[in-house]
Interface confidence: low
């Protein structure tokens, strides 16, 4: 063709896959009449007629472009729809008149790859491998043209390095003409790479310019030998009896070695293996003082059979022993004195307190409690509390009962009980003394006795209210070796409508809707109003 040697470079048209390419025929009016043009595609030096323009009307030629071509811009532009990678070629338009001239267009096609998919080597990498091992694989699917891959470790790009870093990339062409890129990063890793973050980046071009996509970051399992094993105890800090204590072995190797935890036998100083749970943790629950001692961990590498021993760790389970009080069961006459002494052992310094059991009142801070001029009221429970102030919750207690010799002492001297005729009453009478008294009643009924504490007794009587009983009342008598004492219960009739009898006379309420011979509670211990206790 005349003048072909001076052909200018083709015009570049860039378009993304799937969009429409506008191929504008750049022939000037002097070079040819645009109403009479032939369009060709050039592939491997071969021209193929794909479209004719005659008198401004376009006609597709049969073939691969038949359905995708149309004329635009008054016939100066050929529109190619649904562009594919196979469309990346030269298109030319050729004017027929006044003389044959042609205009060349280079169509460039682009497609962004999908997000890169990174897969780490699940088997991991030993640090002492002789040559680079596969770290991860990066796949970028359906890009055009082939994207470039850059590998990063901890944000820094990795370069090929002999015997250290090797990047092996390959690509496949899909039936769509798009490329799938696979890049394998191989590297020799060191122990410090156990936390290294690797990712790959795909660099690609679009008509709008250069772009990139990054994969997620991954870490690769790195295997390195154990250099040190050690013990860890939870909770941290002072331990006490009753705590849940966990002793676990840890190692700086991956995978960790097979662990066994031993406790030194205090008599032979030999290590005796302890039974751990499925996770290799020795659980002491509840911890006891016998668990104190020297523990160590052995880590056995099952591949090399190399065994490592931890530094021994002393475990101290703090304790307070059983508290002993002397005398253990004191008995005293009224007016005499008593010294109570409390003793206990502990792994730490102890504090002692004496409390009155009935009231919780602190009587003494120290191991010795002195009681002088003992009165009957001084009888009862005294509790010694031995505690370790530096370890909250570590304490033991012992209760001692002080008995004051004396005749029975009644909880009340006399009392009114409001009743209805023919009800079964439940009466109660309480007395204390040392020796502990027994209680008898002056009427027939079902009586039962309960020991409240070493000096106190409670007797209950079930009795049917009769006219005679209303007249005589009920007496309970408490007796011991040192004497006897009596309480009287006066029975008063009450109407069913009476809710609260005269507050000056009552100390117990006995209303009931029960029919004859049913039980109503009318106990001498059930009080609506306070009343000073009467002494016998």
């Amino acid at each position: 063709v005349p003048g072909e040697a001076e052909q200018p470079a083709p015009e570049l048209v860039e378009v993304e896959v799937g969009s429409t390419a506008l191929l504008k025929c750049g022939l000037s009016q002097s070079q040819g009449n645009l109403s009479h043009v032939d369009w060709f595609s050039v592939h491997k030096e071969k021209r193929t007629l794909i479209f004719r323009v005659r008198q401004g009307q376009g006609q597709s030629e049969p073939g691969e472009y038949e359905q995708r071509l149309s004329l635009q811009d008054r016939g100066a532009t050929l529109a190619l729809t649904q562009v594919t990678p196979q469309d990346e070629r030269i298109f030319l338009c050729q004017g027929k008149r006044p003389r044959s001239q042609e205009y060349r267009i280079q169509l460039r096609v682009y497609k962004a790859p999908e997000e890169p998919n990174i897969q780490v080597n699940p088997l991991g990498i030993p640090v002492n491998s002789k040559e680079p091992e596969e770290v991860a694989t990066c796949v970028g699917r359906n890009g055009y043209p082939i994207p470039q891959v850059i590998w990063y470790k901890n944000g820094r790009p990795l370069k090929e390095e002999k015997n250290r870093v090797h990047i092996q990339s390959s690509q496949t062409v899909e039936s769509s003409g798009l490329y799938t890129l696979q890049s394998i990063l191989k590297a020799q890793l060191v122990k410090e790479d156990k936390d290294a973050q690797f990712y790959c980046e795909l660099n690609y071009r679009l008509p709008s310019g250069n772009h990139m996509k990054e994969s997620r970051e991954v870490t690769v399992p790195v295997f390195y030998p154990t250099e040190k094993v050690w013990l860890e105890v939870e909770p941290v800090g002072m331990l006490k009896e009753g705590d849940r204590v966990e002793i676990r072995c840890l190692a700086d190797g991956n995978p960790p070695p097979h662990f066994s935890i031993s406790k030194q036998n205090p008599s032979t100083r030999e290590a005796e293996e302890e039974t751990t749970n499925d996770n290799g943790v020795l659980v002491l629950e509840p911890a006891r003082k016998e668990h104190s001692g020297r523990y160590e961990c052995q880590g056995l590498d099952l591949d090399t059979m190399i065994s490592l021993l931890s530094e021994p760790q002393e475990l101290l389970v703090n304790y307070v022993s059983d508290v002993r009080v002397s005398p253990a069961a004191p008995e005293r006459q009224e007016g005499s004195s008593l010294t109570l002494t409390c003793e206990a052992e502990s792994s730490q310094d102890l504090e002692f307190q004496w409390l009155r059991e009935e009231t919780g009142q602190v009587l003494e801070r120290g191991p010795v409690l002195q009681l002088h001029d003992l009165k009957r009221e001084a009888g009862g429970g005294y509790r010694c509390v031995a505690s370790v102030p530096s370890i909250p919750g570590l304490n033991r207690t012992q209760l001692v009962n002080v008995a004051i010799f004396g005749p029975p002492w009644m909880a009340f001297k006399e009392r009114k009980v409001w009743v209805k005729e023919n009800m079964v009453l439940n009466l109660s009478c309480e007395a204390s003394g040392h020796p502990r008294p027994t209680i008898s009643w002056n009427v027939n009924g079902t009586a039962s006795e309960q020991d409240q504490d070493p000096q106190r007794v409670l007797s209950t009587l079930n009795v049917l209210v009769t006219p005679e009983l209303l007249e005589t009342g009920v007496e309970c008598t408490a007796s011991n070796d040192l004497g006897k004492n009596t309480s009287i219960l006066f029975l008063e009739l009450v109407n069913l409508t009476t809710l609260t009898p005269d507050s000056n006379t009552t100390t117990g309420l006995s209303t009931s809707t029960a029919s004859p011979h049913t039980r109503a509670n009318s106990t001498s211990t059930e009080r609506k109003l306070p009343e000073p206790e009467s002494r016998g």
């Epitope: 031993s262 030194q264 100083r269 030999e270 160590e296």
Partner: antibody, heavy 121, light 107 residues
């Protein structure tokens, strides 16, 4: 009563092989590590090799490593020492001993009577 | 690692004799002591901090300090005449070592 009885000793030429056995009774064999200890004529005791109760771990003195192999058959209550590439300096009485392996010490609390191995051309 | 013992000591009948064993491994591990009479297998006489197997007379006692371990026979008897060997794990913890032995003669 704990008893250990060695057998398999004898005269062998340098470079030859020998297999020693130690039959154990009177205790739970698999619960104890076992060791071989030797004593050259007129010399002191020398530890040779040890094996854990399960047989999973084995240990060797540097002087025999690569030539001797310790093993055990817990079903037969028997300890073995396979000796290959024997040298004149391996000539000794070989004792098997029960090895009480603690964290702070190792104790041979029971010993066999020994079997004599002579390596000579 | 090595354990060092005096080759020989003598003691008058009824007197006290102390045999020592030295080595770096004894900073980490206790020694065990064995008695061996001519033509017999060794016999364990002391192990751990100061533990005596049953059947061993209480005239045998043990002690340990730093890199030295000692076996003491208080009131030596004629039947105590024998070679005594100390033993320990080596510093690696996996191997066993014996001392060269001490010949005790009861005069």
């Amino acid at each position: 009563e704990v008893q250990l009885l060695e057998s398999g000793g004898g005269l062998v030429q340098p470079g030859g092989s020998l297999r020693l056995s130690c039959a154990a009774s009177g205790f739970t064999f698999s619960s104890y590590a076992m060791s071989w200890v030797r004593q050259a004529p007129g010399k002191g005791l020398e530890w040779v090799s040890a094996i854990s109760g399960s047989g999973g771990s084995t240990y060797y003195a540097d002087s025999v490593k690569g030539r001797f192999t310790i093993s055990r058959d817990n079903s037969k209550n028997t300890l073995y020492l396979q000796m290959n590439s024997l040298r004149a300096e391996d000539t000794a009485v070989y004792y098997c001993a029960r090895d009480v392996y603690g964290a702070t010490s190792s104790v041979f609390d029971f010993w066999g009577q020994g079997t004599m191995v002579t390596v000579s051309s | 690692s090595e354990l060092t013992q005096d080759p020989a000591v003598s003691v008058a009948l009824g007197q006290t004799v102390r045999i020592t064993c030295q080595g770096d491994s004894l900073r980490l591990y206790y020694a065990s002591w064995y008695q061996q009479k001519p033509g017999q297998a060794p016999l364990l006489v002391m192990y751990g901090k100061s533990n005596r197997p049953s059947g061993i007379p209480d005239r045998f006692s043990g002690s340990s300090s730093g890199s030295t371990s000692s076996l003491t026979i208080t009131g030596a008897q004629a039947e105590d005449e024998a070679d005594y060997y100390c033993s320990s794990r080596d510093t690696s913890g996996n191997h066993l070592v014996f001392g060269g032995g001490t010949k005790v003669t009861v005069l």
